[in-house]
């Protein structure tokens, strides 16, 4: 029960954490302007991976894509990788892990499987929350060097009378939602793979017993087999107690990693 | 069609308070902002703030001390209030629409003069 | 505060001939968001209030002859009547719409010559 409760709930967690992160990577405010110490004007500018914004005190919002590659900055390429990849490894855990819960009957799949699968979908809700804490942290990184570097230059060049105020940018929402996802993937993770713990019969050391009605002579059949979380093991054995027959490879194949850029 | 109406006193006693009225159709007081205006005689257009749709109002800081912007949506109605007035502050006040996307003033009422005089 | 300069003060043009009005601010009122400079430019006939011409530099109002016509960035901008006609005589001022407290330029009266 602690198991089934600890798997659902690591499932749920992840599934907020993923949509959190999907959330994040298309929110527009992942940087704002800074409004501290700055004139006040009746416009503000906020940023996101894909475009960035304009909001005026009337509320008119304009808002303008990236509609270059080449001309990105490395670092922003490289979060919206890293954003990506988190997405697409929690989407695949998700899947993996609604087929591994305990509470859904899909036809004779062992609980050795659904060990498996929820390792399997653990381990991938680890790697996306990592890929998504990463990602917002690369950026919180930039914008904070851009900060120090535009406070340090924002009243250059001001030869004469005229003056040019440059706009500077501070954490935006989509940080921190970011930040919170990815540690709520993570968790998720975690308790997937606890509860692959728990899922994992004891490996068990018994002999089963073959009884024959023709003759008094026992047969032993090979000692107990592990309940192992190892991928590729290829068990054939029949096990008296259950009737199940287990045949199917076990094999987990990993999704290539692709090169967003 | 939008139309804006400026109303109020058209004489005021110096050190008293100068209260005017902006009666605004033909569009919604919380989707646009507006804008009073000064004009002193045959002198140019001096801002005196601002009242956005969402309630956000900004001054002019030199009149941010004696300057009150508020609106009534039930009466369709801006106010602008100005305390301590001198003769310095005769002028025609106009009242101004907000235009939704360049901060600029689209649509103006016909302006009322104010006399400020003992 | 933002320092709108306008100049000249007053402007003498013959019917059909350009006349250029110059402005300018103390700051930049180029916001790097949107690239748009957020500069606007009024007509005010006599007895008669502002009448909005010209918004972010150079967009033209919906209603203005095409005569009209704002340039510049940063803090340089100008309006250029391509050629006068008789109703063009007013006084045009310019108008930071960008930092608060919005504020406008001195105006530069328009006569015909």
């Known amino acids: 029960m602690a198991v089934t409760a600890c798997q659902g709930l690591g499932f749920v967690v992840s599934l907020i954490g993923i949509a959190g992160i999907i959330a994040a990577t298309c929110m527009d405010q992942w940087s704002t302007q800074d409004l501290y110490n700055n004139p006040v004007t009746a416009v503000f500018n906020y940023q996101g991976l894909w475009r960035s914004c304009v909001r005026e005190s009337s509320g008119f919002t304009e808002c303008r894509g990236y509609f270059t590659l080449l001309g990105l900055p490395a670092m922003l390429q490289a979060v919206r990788a890293l954003m990506i990849v988190g997405i697409v490894l929690g989407a695949i855990g998700l899947l993996v892990s609604i087929f591994a819960l305990k509470c859904i009957r899909i036809g004779s799949m062992e609980d050795s499987a659904k060990a498996n699968m929820t390792l399997t979908s653990g381990i991938m809700f680890i790697v996306s929350g990592l890929c998504a804490i990463a990602g917002v942290s690369v950026f919180a990184n930039m914008l904070v060097t851009n900060f120090w570097m535009s406070t340090a230059n924002m009243y250059t060049g001001m030869g004469g009378m005229v003056q040019t105020v440059q706009t500077r940018y501070t954490f935006g929402a989509a940080l921190f939602v970011g930040w919170v996802a990815g540690g709520l993937t993570l968790i998720g993770g975690v308790m997937m793979c606890i509860a692959c713990r728990g899922l994992a019969p004891e490996e068990t050391n018994y002999k089963a017993v073959s009884y024959h009605a023709s003759g008094h002579s026992v047969a032993y059949k090979p000692g107990g087999f592990k309940a192992s979380t190892g991928f590729g093991s290829n068990t054939k054995n029949k096990k008296i107690y259950d009737g199940g027959a287990r045949t199917e490879d076990e094999v987990q194949s990993y999704p290539s990693k692709h090169d967003y850029v | 069609q939008v139309q804006l109406q400026e109303s109020g006193p058209g004489l005021v006693k110096p050190s008293e308070t100068l209260s005017l009225t902006c009666t605004v159709s033909g569009f919604s007081l919380t989707d646009y902002g507006v804008s009073w205006i000064r004009q002193p005689p045959g002198k140019g257009l001096e801002w005196i703030g601002v009242m956005w749709g969402g309630g956000n109002t900004y001054y002019n800081s030199a009149l941010k001390s004696r300057v009150t912007i508020s609106v009534d949506t039930s009466k369709n109605q801006f106010s602008l209030k100005l305390s301590s007035v001198t003769a310095a502050d005769t002028a025609v006040y106009y009242c101004?629409?907000?235009?939704?996307?360049?901060?600029?003033?689209?649509?103006w009422g016909q302006g009322t003069l104010v006399t400020v005089s003992s | 505060d933002i320092v709108m300069t306008q100049s000249p003060d007053s402007l003498a043009v013959s019917l059909g001939e350009r006349a250029t009005i110059n402005c300018k601010s103390s700051?930049?009122?180029?916001?790097?968001?949107?690239?748009?400079?957020?500069l606007t430019w009024y007509q005010q006939k006599p007895g008669q209030p502002p009448k909005l011409l010209i918004y972010w530099a150079s967009t033209r109002e919906s209603g203005v002859p095409d005569r009209f016509s704002g340039s510049g960035s940063g803090t340089d901008f100008t309006l250029t009547i391509s050629s006068l006609q008789a109703e063009d005589v007013a006084v045009y001022y310019c108008?930071?719409?960008?930092?608060?407290?919005?504020?406008f330029g001195g105006g530069t009266k328009v006569e015909i010559k």
């Open positions: 700051q930049s009122l180029l916001n790097s968001g949107n690239q748009r400079n957020y």
């Open positions: 108008q930071n719409s960008y930092f608060y407290p919005f504020t």
């Open positions: 101004a629409r907000q235009r939704y996307g360049g901060n600029a003033m689209d649509y």
